[in-house]
């Protein structure tokens, strides 16, 4: 039951975080203008992954896509990148993940492939998580190095009669939003690993050998089942130790009482 | 058509409080602004102030301690409250409303006010 | 608080004229955001209230002839009048439309020769 849950609250947590990840890099919030210490102006400037904005104090708001790939800086082709490849893996890991949970039943799988798949989901899924958190601390780095270079020459004077307003960035809402979603993929990615090491069939299954007479034709089948003769009921025969693997027809049969929630 | 009207007291005695009322129609005070300028007889405009959509303001620096403006959205009026009036106050107040890149594209006809004893 | 500069205060021109009007601003009016310049220019006519003529600094509002034209960016701004009308003698006033205050120019009166 405890490996159901932590499966299935993994898988939730991904997708919540996943979720986030894919807000945040459609937000055009990334940067935001600096209100602090700066002239109060009648617009807001804030600055996404794919555009800029700026919101008039009148009312209007105007955007303005990036239509350049070549002028664009490395660093924010780099965070595009990054959070791209971060959705790319989590959404890959969603679609294995659904079919790894131990309460959806797909034909006969087995608990090993549920196990394996689960692993795999989960390793994509902290993939994913470091990738968000990556991309977003690369760009709040940028951010901070921008911020104290414009600092440094806020008003440029042309003669020491004009003075030109420099427009200083912060941390836009986007990056918040990109932290905690890979914040939470990640624990998502590391909740089915450990899921995974719940599910995973036991290596070391004793076989049941059953010991006869001379004469008699001695058949057993390994994994700890009925082990028998060629002739009628065998009585002597016990089962030593059951690791948790079941033949095809007992999957089947006998579903466990962790295959429902 | 978007049109602003502005009513005022015409004649105010030094030292009294100022209010004109600014009613707007065919536009909301929710989405839109309205700023506040005057104009002193034979000279040039002064801008006082601004209400904006989400009811923040901003004032002229050299007014701010004796100015405010209000509005009240369900009957879509804004007013204009001046403090401490002197004679220097004497001017033709208009409401305008800001439209793109903030420039003012539709304004009231103006209230005259004088401030004597 | 910005202050903007008007020249000429006065202007005597002939009908059918070109006239050049330049507008000062102690601090950039261009929001670096998206490159617009942030500064408005109005017509005044005796016993009127203000009346826009241009946005942006270059943007006519809708309805104004075409022979006002707005240039500049910055903190040098100009309007030109193409071929001035009788009907095009006012106060013209340039207002700074992005740093509080939103200051006025002192204006520039155009006058018939």
């Known amino acids: 039951m405890a490996v159901t849950a932590c499966q299935g609250l993994g898988f939730v947590v991904s997708l919540i975080g996943i979720a986030g990840i894919i807000a945040a890099t459609c937000m055009d919030q990334w940067s935001t203008q600096d209100l602090y210490n700066n002239p109060v102006t009648a617009v807001f400037n804030y600055q996404g992954l794919w555009r800029s904005c700026v919101r008039e104090s009148s009312g209007f708001t105007e955007c303005r896509g990036y239509f350049t790939l070549l002028g664009l800086p490395a660093m924010l082709q780099a965070v595009r990148a990054l959070m791209i490849v971060g959705i790319v893996l989590g959404a890959i890991g969603l679609l294995v993940s659904i079919f790894a949970l131990k309460c959806i039943r797909i034909g006969s799988m087995e608990d090993s492939a549920k196990a394996n798949m689960t692993l795999t989901s989960g390793i994509m899924f902290i993939v994913s998580g470091l990738c968000a958190i990556a991309g977003v601390s690369v760009f709040a780095n940028m951010l901070v190095t921008n911020f104290w270079m414009s600092t440094a020459n806020m008003y440029t004077g042309m003669g020491g009669m004009v003075q030109t307003v420099q427009t200083r960035y912060t941390f836009g809402a986007a990056l918040f939003v990109g932290w905690v979603a890979g914040g939470l993929t990640l624990i998502g990615g590391v909740m089915m690993c450990i899921a995974c090491r719940g599910l995973a069939p036991e290596e070391t299954n004793y076989k049941a050998v059953s010991y006869h007479a001379s004469g008699h034709s001695v058949a057993y089948k390994p994994g700890g089942f009925k082990a028998s003769t060629g002739f009628g009921s065998n009585t002597k025969n016990k089962k030593i130790y059951d690791g948790g693997a079941r033949t095809e027809d007992e999957v089947q049969s006998y579903p466990s009482k962790h295959d429902y929630v | 058509q978007v049109q602003l009207k502005e009513s005022g007291p015409g004649l105010v005695a030094p030292s009294q409080s100022l209010s004109i009322t600014c009613t707007v129609s065919?536009?909301?005070?929710?989405?839109?602004?309205v700023s506040w300028v005057r104009q002193p007889p034979g000279k040039g405009l002064e801008w006082l102030g601004v209400?904006?959509?989400?009811?923040?303001?901003n004032y002229h620096s050299a007014l701010i301690s004796r100015l405010s403006i209000s509005k009240d959205t369900s009957k879509s009026q804004v007013f204009l409250k001046l403090n401490s009036l002197q004679t220097d106050d004497t001017a033709t107040y208009y409401c305008?409303?800001?439209?793109?890149?903030?420039?003012?594209?539709?304004w009231g006809q103006g209230t005259s006010v004088t401030v004597s004893s | 608080d910005i202050v903007m500069t008007q020249s000429p205060s006065s202007l005597s021109v002939s009908a059918g004229e070109k006239v050049t009007m330049s507008c000062k601003s102690s601090?950039?009016?261009?929001?670096?955001?998206?490159?617009?310049?942030?500064l408005a220019w109005y017509q005044q006519k005796p016993g009127q209230p203000p009346k826009l003529l241009i946005y942006?600094?270059?943007t006519r509002e809708s309805g104004v002839p075409d022979r006002f034209t707005g240039s500049g960016s910055g903190t040098d701004f100009t309007l030109t009048i193409s071929s001035v009308q009788a009907e095009d003698l006012a106060v013209y006033y340039c207002?700074?439309?992005?740093?509080?205050?939103?200051?006025f120019g002192a204006g520039t009166k155009l006058e018939l020769k």
């Open positions: 305008a409303k800001p439209g793109l890149r903030n420039a003012m594209d539709y």
């Open positions: 065919e536009f909301s005070l929710t989405t839109y602004g």
């Open positions: 209400i904006w959509g989400d009811g923040s303001t």
């Open positions: 601090q950039s009016l261009l929001n670096s955001g998206n490159q617009k310049n942030y």
């Open positions: 942006g600094a270059s």
């Open positions: 207002q700074n439309d992005l740093i509080y205050p939103l200051t």
